[in-house]
Every structure is written in structure tokens, then in C-alpha cells.
């Protein structure tokens, strides 16, 4: 697994470097998670032909994965910092159960899957420090999460492969949208 942000050898070798600002730390954390997702996608694509599946076929899935919409205030038109930040944190919290699902889905990248999960937790904590209105954030209901996880794990092999691919693709897209929005804040 790659070394988490702030622990690479360059950081150790340059103690005089200015400490990262909160925004830089968040940016670096997202890019680190995106690198981890790329590695996981590589294993998924090597293992199955899901990556060639047409967008239309993938769109027919019934997964309720977090997605950015116009009303979330994260796009350039209608940008709203606080609304967007709430959406990013809420979305990341909603992705947690899907990241839990991914934990047993990889053979050679098991550590990488765990690193993505743990790094996402760290990112959520960074973002919470930035948010002014935590009351607007609804956390996932554990009972709902449990039945979702059970349902996902009960799928046949082909559907599990498809689900893994969809989670990684959606999470990547969500993080990329988040990164663009956070750079405007």
C-alpha cells in the first residue's frame, strides 16, 4: 500500500518545509485516496471484463451510490460553500458501508482496500473541522447499512464483480467532483 500523506520520505528529508495548510492537507488526502482507487480498479479490471461494460448497462444497477447534483452547490454554477461541504461529508459517510463491502473483494490488493477505507475516515475528520454546520449532516442509519451490506454480499459472483466496479467508479467520480469544489473554497 502507498504511504499515507505526510509520511513519505521526502517529508522526513525536508523538516524546514512549511507545514501544509488545512486545504492542502485535504487536497493531498483526496489525491492519495484516488491513487488507492486506481490500484483497486486495476485489479478489478484485470480480473473481470466489467471495465468494458457500457455505461448504459451499468446505469441499470439499483445501487444508491452518492452522486453530486446541481442542488448540492458543488458545481461552478450555483456554487455554495457550506451546502457543498455538507454534501461532501454526507456522501463520504454514505460511501463507508460500500467501502466496508470492498474489504473482502480483493486478493492482491487487500491492504490497499483497507488503506482507502481508513484514509476516507481521516478525510472526513479533516472536512468536519472545516464545516460550520454539522447539524445539517445526516449520518447513515446502521440498521439500513446492515441490511444493504447483507443484500450486496448475497449477490451472485457476476453481480458482486459489477458492484465492486460500480462502487470504485462512483467513489472516484465523487472524489474528483469534491476535489474540484474544495479547490474553490
Amino acid at each position: 500500500a502507498p504511504v499515507p500523506p505526510g509520511e513519505d520520505s521526502k517529508d522526513v528529508a525536508a523538516p524546514h518545509r512549511q507545514p501544509l495548510t488545512s486545504s492542502e492537507r485535504i487536497d493531498k488526502q483526496i489525491r492519495y485516496i484516488l491513487d488507492g482507487i486506481s490500484a483497486l480498479r486495476k485489479e478489478t479490471c484485470n480480473k473481470s471484463n466489467m471495465c468494458e461494460s457500457s455505461k448504459e448497462a451499468l446505469a441499470e444497477n439499483n445501487l444508491n451510490l452518492p452522486k453530486m447534483a446541481e442542488k448540492d452547490g458543488c458545481f461552478q454554477s450555483g456554487f455554495n460553500e457550506e451546502t457543498c461541504l455538507v454534501k461532501i461529508i454526507t456522501g463520504l459517510l454514505e460511501f463507508e458501508v460500500y467501502l466496508e463491502y470492498l474489504q473482502n473483494r480483493f486478493e492482491s490488493s487487500e491492504e490497499q482496500a483497507r488503506a482507502v477505507q481508513m484514509s476516507t475516515k481521516v478525510l472526513i475528520q479533516f472536512l468536519q473541522k472545516k464545516a460550520k454546520n454539522l447539524d445539517a449532516i445526516t449520518t447513515p442509519d446502521p440498521t439500513t447499512n446492515a441490511s444493504l451490506l447483507t443484500k450486496l454480499q448475497a449477490q451472485n459472483q457476476w453481480l458482486q464483480d459489477m458492484t465492486t466496479h460500480l462502487i470504485l467508479r462512483s467513489f472516484k467520480e465523487f472524489l474528483q467532483s469534491s476535489l474540484r469544489a474544495l479547490r474553490q473554497m
Epitope: 459517510l93 475516515k121 468536519q128 449520518t139 446502521p142 440498521t143 447483507t150
Partner: nanobody
Framework: AVQLVDSGGGLVQAGGSLRLSCAAS????????MGWFRQPPGKVREFVGR???????NYADSVKGRFTISRDNNNNTVYLQMNRLKPEDTAVYYC????????????WGQGTQVTVSS
């Protein structure tokens, strides 16, 4: 598994306050979510509020602004501070822990009775 022990219930007059505690013992206590539920007499158990691993809290509409959940990780304890109590808050209160994001509430306290008299 984690053992949860609820305490702090009692008889209180309408408008009064109580603080319930939920102490955890067992393996390392860092659950995904801790929740409070209640079961009024003759009714089904209902959600009161929860606090997730990162400290974000959510409450049922009926208790918003009156009840506050907090946690003390050093003492492995979660609290439910109940202010401006009403007779309809009378119930057995339970705390519950979800150990992981996909586990559901997999540990429950034994419950503590709260009675609010008018």
C-alpha cells in the same frame, strides 16, 4: 462482544432534566455508531438519537433541541442529556452500539426506566 450498561433513569417532574449514561466494557470501544432508543409503555421501540464515530449527532424530531448525546472515549461512556422533559418522554431507554458500518446495532444495554410525571 461489547457489554453495555445503561443507568441514570428515574422519576422526574415535567420540565425537569436527567442524564442517562451508557458504559461499555469488553473489547476496545470504538464503535461506528452509538444510538439511544426508547420504548414507551405499550408501544414499539423508537429511535431517539445517535452519535457516529466522528462525533456527528442526529436526533428524532420529537427530542430535537431538548436532548443532547455526547461521548467520553476515555471512559468508554456515552451520555444522553435530557432537558425540558415531558410526560410523553416516559419510556424505558436503551443504548446500542454498531461496531462497524455494516453491522447494524449489534450490542444493546439492558435499559433504564425514565418516568416523567405531570
Amino acid at each position: 462482544a461489547v457489554q453495555l450498561v445503561d443507568s441514570g433513569g428515574g422519576l422526574v417532574q415535567a420540565g425537569g432534566s436527567l442524564r442517562l449514561s451508557c458504559a461499555a466494557s469488553g473489547r476496545t470501544f470504538s464503535p461506528y455508531t452509538m444510538g439511544w432508543f426508547r420504548q414507551p409503555p405499550g408501544k414499539v421501540r423508537e429511535f431517539v438519537g445517535r452519535i457516529n464515530w466522528s462525533g456527528i449527532r442526529n436526533y428524532a424530531d420529537s427530542v430535537k433541541g431538548r436532548f443532547t448525546i455526547s461521548r467520553d472515549n476515555n471512559n468508554n461512556t456515552v451520555y444522553l442529556q435530557m432537558n425540558r422533559l415531558k410526560p410523553e418522554d416516559t419510556a424505558v431507554y436503551y443504548c446500542a452500539a454498531a461496531s462497524q458500518s455494516g453491522s447494524g446495532y449489534d450490542s444493546w444495554g439492558q435499559g433504564t426506566q425514565v418516568t416523567v410525571s405531570s
